[in-house]
């Protein structure tokens, strides 16, 4: 007995052959014995079978002795054995139908499961083997679990069922719900205008939902929320905005906010969480602020950073095309009775520069100027 | 020529059975369907059921599920048609018919009356 | 099951007039460009005789003054000119699916 694997939804064609090369009397039945087609000249007539409206063939093959039985919009309950009698023989074509959804939905958040469920027919032992966008294997029966979804894993999921030695393919799109980036660190002067961009990494027709920017400055003892917003259709409206910082919105996507001004007090690091309409859980992402501030007092010139800033960067003060006077990984560095001139206060990662600030020392007799 | 040649008529007691016989000539048996109908006494016409000569498969209308049995035996081309636990609604006129080239029933036997009476 | 409903029941024509006979189908009885209706005449103690098939072709030997038209589930049988041999009652019946059902019948008189 022939077996044909069909997926759920497509259309199969089974087939039949005569030894003749002409038009002769065929007919498809089921295995209850229930006529699904048949022809009467060369014309088709169907039977009273549950495939009446989703059965046919191809009257232009029957010329040459060939009488498929094409069933379209598969359902897994179509899986049955098909017998084709032409001539004085029958043709026996087991078609066996499998389906393979995802759990409720395609779109799904950053860290949440995914399972993907076989149906299949009654009697039959599939095993499954599914391919991620990013090439990861995983293995299952009636059920496959990937907990933990990662951004890499948005994308088309091939899945193979294997049975009785035939393989039908199966591809799913999956939408993982995310911003591009998990964190991000905006370096600024004081007094600087910052801009925060919350791009995400996914685009969808329509896109509803509310979000907030938490805030825990360094300074502070507890966070605040800085802004309240609701998202309609892509259209971006405030709800509640606190008066200092008076953070200002676009009203188009990505996400982007404006802070007036760069203030040591607002240095610190936020929480942007976006809660999408209809879905469990919230999409989040990190962003930090660096404020650098050079400033020279009496004999004293000091640079300071304030923010969420790691051990390894170097905070250095130099005079202009000279030598570092003093580099430390520290939050702060000083020098005292500094020369006249134009001198600049890096912080920098294995000698690249995030963050300069200049500032002008002028003779003794004069007060400090800074550009 | 085609001809189809129908048993004579029966007249049984109601809870009998009956069988009755279509000898097909002027075609090879095999390659067309029979098809069975009745017509009740100035009543309309009805599909009871067709059978493939050549694998002896046979298709019925719900209707006469349990009622009619179709069989055909090629070595003699004859179709046959067996009728059980008769009541007096199966007195009819019943009919064996095949398909021309086309869609309708162009070949038709004369009919063999049943009449169901104690 | 494919209802077929002709009108009208009956009807009287003159001889050598028209006659025409509707058969409404509960559901289209066309597949791949074809009208799977046809039409009989039976005459009283007489099998059907098979006029036309698949909506409009006239079956061999049949004369020419018969002939059908219609798609989908509106088909009509018309006669003409009427002769005098052309009193019988008239079915239509579909052959789309199983069961292939019969209109209720027409019955012809000649005036």
């Known amino acids: 007995k022939k077996v044909v694997l069909g997926k759920k939804g497509d259309t199969v064609e089974l087939t039949c052959t005569a030894s003749q090369k002409k038009s002769i009397q065929f007919h498809w039945k089921n295995s209850n014995q229930i006529k699904i087609l048949g022809n009467q000249g060369s014309f088709l007539t169907k039977g009273p079978s549950k495939l009446n409206d989703r059965a046919d063939s191809r009257r232009s093959l029957w010329d040459q002795g060939n009488f498929p039985l094409i069933i379209k919009n598969l359902k897994i309950e179509d899986s049955d054995t098909y017998i084709c009698e032409v001539e004085d023989q029958k043709e026996e074509v087991q078609l066996l139908v499998f389906g393979l959804t995802a759990n409720s939905d395609t779109h799904l958040l950053q860290g949440q499961s995914l399972t993907l469920t076989l149906e299949s027919p009654p009697g039959s032992s599939p095993s499954v083997q599914c391919r991620s966008p990013r090439g990861k294997n995983i293995q299952g029966g009636k059920t496959l679990s990937v907990s933990q979804l990662e951004l890499q894993d948005s994308g088309t999921w091939t899945c193979t069922v294997l049975q009785n030695q035939k393989k039908v393919e199966f591809k799913i799109d999956i939408v993982v719900l995310a911003f591009q980036k998990a964190s991000s660190i905006v370096y600024k002067k004081e007094g600087e205008q910052v801009e925060f961009s919350f791009p995400l990494a996914f685009t969808v027709e329509k896109l509803t939902g509310s979000g907030e920017l938490w805030w825990q400055a360094e300074r502070a003892s507890s966070s605040k929320s800085w802004i309240t917003f609701d998202l309609k259709n892509k259209e971006v409206s405030v709800k509640r905005v606190t008066q200092d910082p008076k953070l200002q919105m676009g009203k188009k996507l990505p996400l982007h906010l404006t802070l007036p001004q760069a203030l040591p007090q607002y240095a610190g690091s936020g929480n942007l969480t976006l809660a999408l309409e209809a879905k469990t859980g919230k999409l989040h992402q990190e962003v930090n602020l660096v404020v650098m501030r050079a400033t020279q007092l009496q004999k004293n010139l000091t640079c300071e950073v304030w923010g969420p800033t790691s051990p390894k960067l170097m905070l250095s003060l130099k005079l202009e095309n000279k030598e570092a006077k003093v580099s430390k990984r520290e939050k702060a560095v000083w020098v005292l009775n500094p020369e006249a001139g134009m001198w600049q206060c890096l912080l920098s990662d294995s000698g690249q520069v995030l963050l300069e600030s200049n500032i002008k020392v002028l003779p003794t007799w004069s007060t400090p100027v800074q550009p | 020529q085609v001809q189809l040649q129908q048993s004579g008529p029966e007249l049984v007691k109601p809870g009998a059975s009956v069988k009755m016989s279509c000898k097909a000539s002027g075609y090879t048996f095999t390659d067309y369907v029979i098809n069975w109908l009745n017509q009740r006494t100035g009543q309309g016409l009805e599909w009871i059921g067709e059978i493939y000569p050549g694998s002896g498969s046979a298709y019925y209308n719900e209707m006469f599920k349990g009622k009619a049995t179709l069989t055909a035996d090629k070595s003699s081309n004859t179709a046959y048609m067996q009728l059980s636990s008769l009541t007096s609604e199966d007195s009819a006129v019943y009919f064996c018919?095949?398909?021309?080239?086309?869609?309708?029933?162009?070949?038709w036997g004369r009919g063999t009356l049943v009449t169901v009476s104690a | 099951d494919i209802v077929l409903t002709q009108s009208p029941a009956s009807l009287a024509v003159s001889l050598g007039q028209r006659a025409t006979i509707s058969c409404k189908a509960s559901?289209?009885?066309?597949?791949?460009?074809?009208?799977?209706m046809n039409w009989y005449q039976q005459k009283p103690g007489q099998p059907p005789k098979l006029l036309i098939y698949?909506?409009?072709n006239l079956e061999s030997g049949i004369p020419a003054r018969f002939s059908g038209s219609g798609s989908g589930t509106d088909f009509t049988l018309n006669i003409h000119p009427v002769e005098e041999e052309d009193a019988a009652t008239y079915y239509c019946?579909?052959?789309?699916?199983?069961?292939?059902?019969f209109g209720g019948g027409t019955k012809l008189e000649i005036k």
């Open positions: 018919a095949r398909r021309g080239t086309g869609t309708g029933f162009a070949y």
């Open positions: 019946q579909q052959s789309s699916e199983d069961p292939p059902t």
């Open positions: 698949a909506a409009s």
């Open positions: 559901q289209s009885v066309d597949y791949d460009g074809d009208s799977y």
